[in-house]
Amino acid sequence: PEPPTACREKQYLINSQCCSLCQPGQKLVSDCTEFTETECLPCGESEFLDTWNRETHCHQHKYCDPNLGLRVQQKGTSETDTICTCEEGWHCTSEACESCVLHRSCSPGFGVKQIATGVSDTICEPCPVGFFSNVSSAFEKCHPWTSCETKDLVVQQAGTNKTDVVCGPQDRLRA
């Protein structure tokens, strides 16, 4: 018979014949022959392969380096890699989370629009007229100025984006 030019799914072509790929979690030890099946071996501790493959070496599990602010989010198996995430208060500096940096704080005059997560940084926004923030914070929103009127007081000092209004008693007309 004619040697195959293409093989079925989960097979590969070698020496003019189709051999079975190794299943996820296993690596190739030897190709099949006319008389023998493909020989595969399970990946060792701290190794994995996540696809049907003909790899002769398993991949090393990713190391979540604490020096880079990383910790293990999900432990790897023979078929999956370790997933790293950032320590509390830190966020990833790239899509694959290769390292972490501290969440940004919003300076006075700015409030938190969106609190940081493990993968995205704090989003700050300037406090609009009528609101203020007098602290540098990673979670405080802009606060509304105090309403002097509701306390039967008057504004003695106008508010800014960094300071609240100062209320005081209304001047009484002398008799």
């Epitope: 994995f48 996540d50 070496h57 991949h59 090393q60 990713k62 880079l68 890699d81 966020h91 990833c92 500096t93 790239s94 899509e95 694959a96 989370c97 290769e98 390292s99 940096v101 501290l102 940004r104 993968v119 995205s120 940084d121």
Partner: antibody, heavy 112, light 112 residues
């Protein structure tokens, strides 16, 4: 990490370079392309993230495409509309701002 | 794109001495900065990331410091083998549309 052979490319042509990796999964790491013109410094071209997102330097965005094949463990850079200014050694490296594994680089010469 | 400005270049120092290289980022990149050493005909080698953390197998004679926009690489007890070009690289990433990455222009270190 190993880049395919570069060589001589004509102006206006498209460059295709392939980077083959082993020992780690492309689904778990970002991969960057960096180039270096003769006698010059390093220049970041772009990257493909562990989840598959693509990122380009502003100068490269309009004429570069980075793709990957996680089954074949390959990352490919295509760059169109080449000029003599694109003559450089092109490196493939693992990471984003922590490029801890580099290929040896491949020299691409753009000339007619 | 992030612009990283390295100074000075070149810089020279005597064997056993100390040299300092500065890197200034155009925007706040927190501690997300790497330092690389490159010798002629070789790919760059990661020395430090992030900002002050020594990469595996790198001599403690190399010291990184700084955060935000100002960073420094100090090489003490200079050896002839330290003669090379040094690059800083910095960036940030929060989403596929909010990112930046770039290299400094490089600083050549001459050891006398």
């Amino acid at each position: 990490v190993r880049e395919s052979e570069g060589g001589l490319v004509k102006p206006t042509d498209t460059l295709t370079l392939t980077c083959t990796v082993s020992g780690f999964s492309l689904s778990s790491y970002d991969m960057s392309w960096v180039r270096q013109a003769p006698g010059n410094g390093l220049e970041w071209i772009g990257a493909i993230g562990g989840a598959g997102g693509t990122y380009y330097a502003s100068w490269a965005k309009s004429r570069s495409t980075i793709t990957r094949n996680t089954n074949l463990n390959t990352v490919t850079l295509k760059m169109s509309s080449l000029t003599a200014a694109d003559t450089a050694t092109y490196f493939c490296a693992r990471g984003w701002t922590r490029l801890d594994l580099w290929g040896q680089g491949t020299l691409v010469t753009v000339s007619s | 794109d992030i612009v990283l400005t390295q100074t000075p270049s070149p810089v020279s120092g005597a064997v056993g001495g100390t040299v300092t290289i500065k890197c200034q980022a155009s925007e706040d990149i927190s501690s997300n900065l790497a330092w690389y050493q490159q010798k002629p005909g070789q790919p760059p080698k990661l020395l430090i990331f992030p900002a002050s953390n020594l990469a595996s197998g790198v001599s403690s004679r190399f010291k990184g410091s700084g955060s935000g926009t100002e960073f420094t690489l100090t090489i003490s007890d200079l050896e002839c083998a330290d003669a090379a070009t040094y690059y800083c690289q910095g960036g940030y990433w929060t989403s596929t549309s909010n990112f930046g990455n770039g290299f400094g222009g490089g600083t050549e270190v001459v050891v006398k």
